[in-house]
């Protein structure tokens, strides 16, 4: 690595992956192992993030970019940058202080993480329950009870024609 001869800051020419070494007359020195500099002109290299235990390495640290961690199988990330790993549960369960517990009647969870949420109350929208809810799935709401009363037409109007090349939303 050449010593820079810039008239301004002699460190400004040190590229990413190096640091401006004050102990060596401001020579651009490569980042030591387990460290990186993602921008030029740095006076130190940053330590790489360590992925250990319940974390696994998603992306190795290089001289110019930090490591990235995610969680080992059976766990999922919480917090920005995957700062914590939390145990997965099955669909139809939620994680409590006592471990994975089935959703109470009237609630569901369709993911391996998060909490059980109440089934949709169809009647609030003036609709009826078309498909019952389960621990894993929300109820499916259908037409309002009035729409299904005797004499009411169950024929739906034809869908408007779509322009070619447009996919349904």
């Amino acid at each position: 690595f050449e010593r820079t001869r810039s008239l301004q800051d002699p460190c400004s020419n040190c590229p990413a992956g190096t640091f401006c070494d004050n102990n060596r007359n401001q020579i651009c020195s490569p980042c030591p192992p387990n460290s990186f500099s993602s921008a030029g002109g740095q006076r130190t290299c940053d330590i790489c993030r360590q992925c250990k235990g319940v974390f696994r390495t998603r992306k190795e640290c290089s001289s110019t970019s930090n490591a990235e961690c995610d969680c080992t199988p059976g766990f999922h990330c919480l917090g920005a940058g995957c700062s914590m790993c939390e145990q997965d549960c099955k669909q139809g369960q939620e994680l409590t202080k006592k471990g994975c517990k089935d959703c109470c009647f009237g609630t569901f969870n369709d993911q391996k993480r998060g909490i059980c949420r109440p089934w949709t109350n169809c009647s609030l929208d003036g609709k009826s329950v078309l498909v019952n809810g389960t621990k894993e799935r929300d109820v499916v709401c259908g037409p309002s009870p009035a729409d299904l009363s005797p004499g009411a037409s169950s024929v739906t109007p034809p869908a408007p024609a779509r322009e070619p090349g447009h996919s349904p939303q």
Epitope: D46, I47, K52, G53, N66, T72, E86, G99
Partner: antibody, heavy 116, light 107 residues
Framework: QVQLVQSGAEVKKPGASVKVSCKAS????????INWVRQATGQGLEWMGW????????GYAQKFQGRVTMTRNTSISTAYMELSSLRSEDTAVYYC?????????WGQGTLVTVSS | DIQMTQSPSSLSASVGDRVTITCRAS??????LNWYQQKPGKAPKLLIY???SLQSGVPSRFSGSGSGTDFTLTISSLQPEDFATYYC?????????FGPGTKVDIK
Amino acid sequence: QVQLVQSGAEVKKPGASVKVSCKASGYTFTSYDINWVRQATGQGLEWMGWMNPNSGNTGYAQKFQGRVTMTRNTSISTAYMELSSLRSEDTAVYYCARETGPFDYWGQGTLVTVSS
Amino acid sequence: DIQMTQSPSSLSASVGDRVTITCRASQRINNYLNWYQQKPGKAPKLLIYGASSLQSGVPSRFSGSGSGTDFTLTISSLQPEDFATYYCQQSYSTPFTFGPGTKVDIK
């Protein structure tokens, strides 16, 4: 629920060794690293090292290198921390903690007194 | 090794006060910063992880912010049970290190 239960208080003579245990329950012991942290009376928290219960791999703070050994017995979901060549400055409460990134569960602490 | 500093080392406050504690890392640790509360004779308790995420079961009056090297723990309205010592800790890279602590006592 998740619990880390540590062994009882110990009184040791200078130069002796102490082995503190930490029994885990309420989760899969081999899934998370166990860390050890100590605290002298009226002082702050001092990180000592970690142990991976699955592999047995360890990492120690430089200050304790050569004096500390962290081990485990997976069949009884228990981690151990042994500190040798004890001196009076090692008098402290020793904690084990589960690492999920942060330390989300801690043992109740074990007081180790080093006195002649 | 990454050094952690905290300020102030102690503070006196009254119930209902807004309390702010700062923590600084000697190098960038992104958001891998955790806050713990410790009461005399008890083990530390996790309050905040990932600089700003509230641990399950912790009251919402506790909040955390910051990224890089500078971080803050805020208690929006101090309650009697909040008088304790607070520690920051980096979980970015071993050796994991703690700040020296901030003792919050009654004015």
